[in-house]
């Protein structure tokens, strides 16, 4: 069987990474620190009332490339930043909400002329 790091992409880190977690701490976290084979992240998004909420934590290697790509989601303002350069590197990530577009002010199928 292949050992860690010998498999095909995505390439596993040779060692576990520790990240700060907030509002996103898994059961195996301790003292707001989680562990991962992937990335640390910090994310900002609007809740249902439009209030910005910051969460941070760990992303596993599987699928994290996609999750860390900050692809816009229609009708949802959010931004995510990921890092791997050191333990708890996400303490220093400060993503900001993308600016409101005109259409974000409008509900339903009403369009500006």
């Amino acid at each position: 069987k292949k050992e860690d790091g010998e498999s095909t992409a995505p390439t596993a880190r040779p060692k576990v990474l520790r990240c700060k977690c907030h509002h996103h701490c898994p059961e195996d976290s301790v003292n707001n620190i989680c562990s991962t084979d992937g990335y640390c992240f910090t994310m900002i998004e609007e809740d249902d009332s439009g209030t910005p909420v910051v969460t941070s934590g760990c992303l596993g290697l599987e699928g994290s490339d996609f999750q860390c790509r900050d692809t816009p989601i229609p009708h949802q303002r959010r931004s995510i930043e990921c890092c791997t350069e050191r333990n708890e590197c996400n303490k220093d990530l400060h993503p900001t909400l993308p600016p409101l577009k005109d259409r974000d002010f409008v509900d339903g199928p009403i369009h500006h002329k």
Partner: antibody
Framework: QVQLQQPGAELVKPGASVKLSCKAS????????MQWVKQRPGQGLEWIGE????????LYNQKFKGKATLTVDTSSSTAYMQLSSLTSEDSAVYFC?????????WGQGTTLTVSS | DVVMTQTPLSLPVSLGDQASISCRSS???????????LHWYLQKPGQSPKLLIY???NRFSGVPDRFSGSGSGTDFTLKISRVEAEDLGVYFC?????????FGSGTKLEIK
């Protein structure tokens, strides 16, 4: 090949401190965590804590906080564990071990004897 | 802390026999990444432990294929298909899913 060299034995007096060393070779020192494990005669293994040599980030077993302090010297690829306020309960074999997601390689261990 | 319970404490075997060691954890060892960080080590008298099996069932480099690991969640087993003299010693299971990492109390494999 991976080697973790530890002194064979240390004899210290109660109340004193000791700094145990672990010299790593055969791999990139900063690419793996270094863990420390305690084994008392005829007893099991106890995890003390770990240090990431790339940023000196440490995690400790709550039980050993205040007792053990982990440090590294990356220039010599050496990890250290200082044990303070020693008592007979600290007499044990102390292993350093290379850790990625599990302990892959262990040092031979240092036998610490605390005695007046 | 996660308690690792190993059985039996002592396992007398004849050379060539199959040996089986059980390890139970007090909570699930499935990590949030999906990996299960349960490992097996062998410690011979006067030596440091050596890694045999990592992440439940993966043999470490140089470990003979007579060693195999299985299990999931909280129940794990190490099997030695045909015990050889060099296999004698104390076997420990260990988990690195939850901090602090913990070890089983050990199973002593000895000649009957």
């Amino acid at each position: 090949q991976v080697q973790l060299q530890q002194p064979g034995a240390e004899l210290v007096k109660p109340g004193a401190s000791v700094k145990l060393s672990c010299k790593a070779s055969g791999y990139t020192f900063t690419s793996y965590w270094m863990q420390w494990v305690k084994q008392r005669p005829g007893q099991g293994l106890e995890w003390i804590g770990e240090i990431d040599p790339s940023d000196s980030y440490t995690l400790y077993n709550q039980k050993f906080k205040g007792k053990a302090t982990l440090t590294v010297d990356t220039s010599s690829s050496t990890a250290y564990m200082q044990l303070s306020s020693l008592t007979s309960e600290d007499s044990a074999v102390y292993f350093c071990a290379r850790f990625g997601y599990y302990i892959e390689y262990w040092g031979q261990g240092t036998t610490l004897t605390v005695s007046s | 802390d996660v308690v690792m319970t190993q059985t039996p404490l002592s396992l007398p075997v004849s050379l060539g026999d199959q040996a089986s060691i059980s390890c139970r954890s007090s909570q699930s060892l499935v990590h949030s990444t999906g990996n299960t960080y349960l490992h097996w080590y062998l410690q011979k008298p006067g030596q440091s432990p050596k890694l045999l099996i990592y992440k439940v069932s993966n043999r470490f480099s140089g470990v003979p294929d007579r060693f195999s690991g299985s299990g999931s969640g909280t129940d794990f087993t190490l099997k030695i298909s045909r015990v050889e003299a060099e296999d004698l010693g104390v076997y420990f299971c260990s988990q690195s899913t939850h901090v602090p990492f913990t070890f089983g109390s050990g199973t002593k494999l000895e000649i009957k």
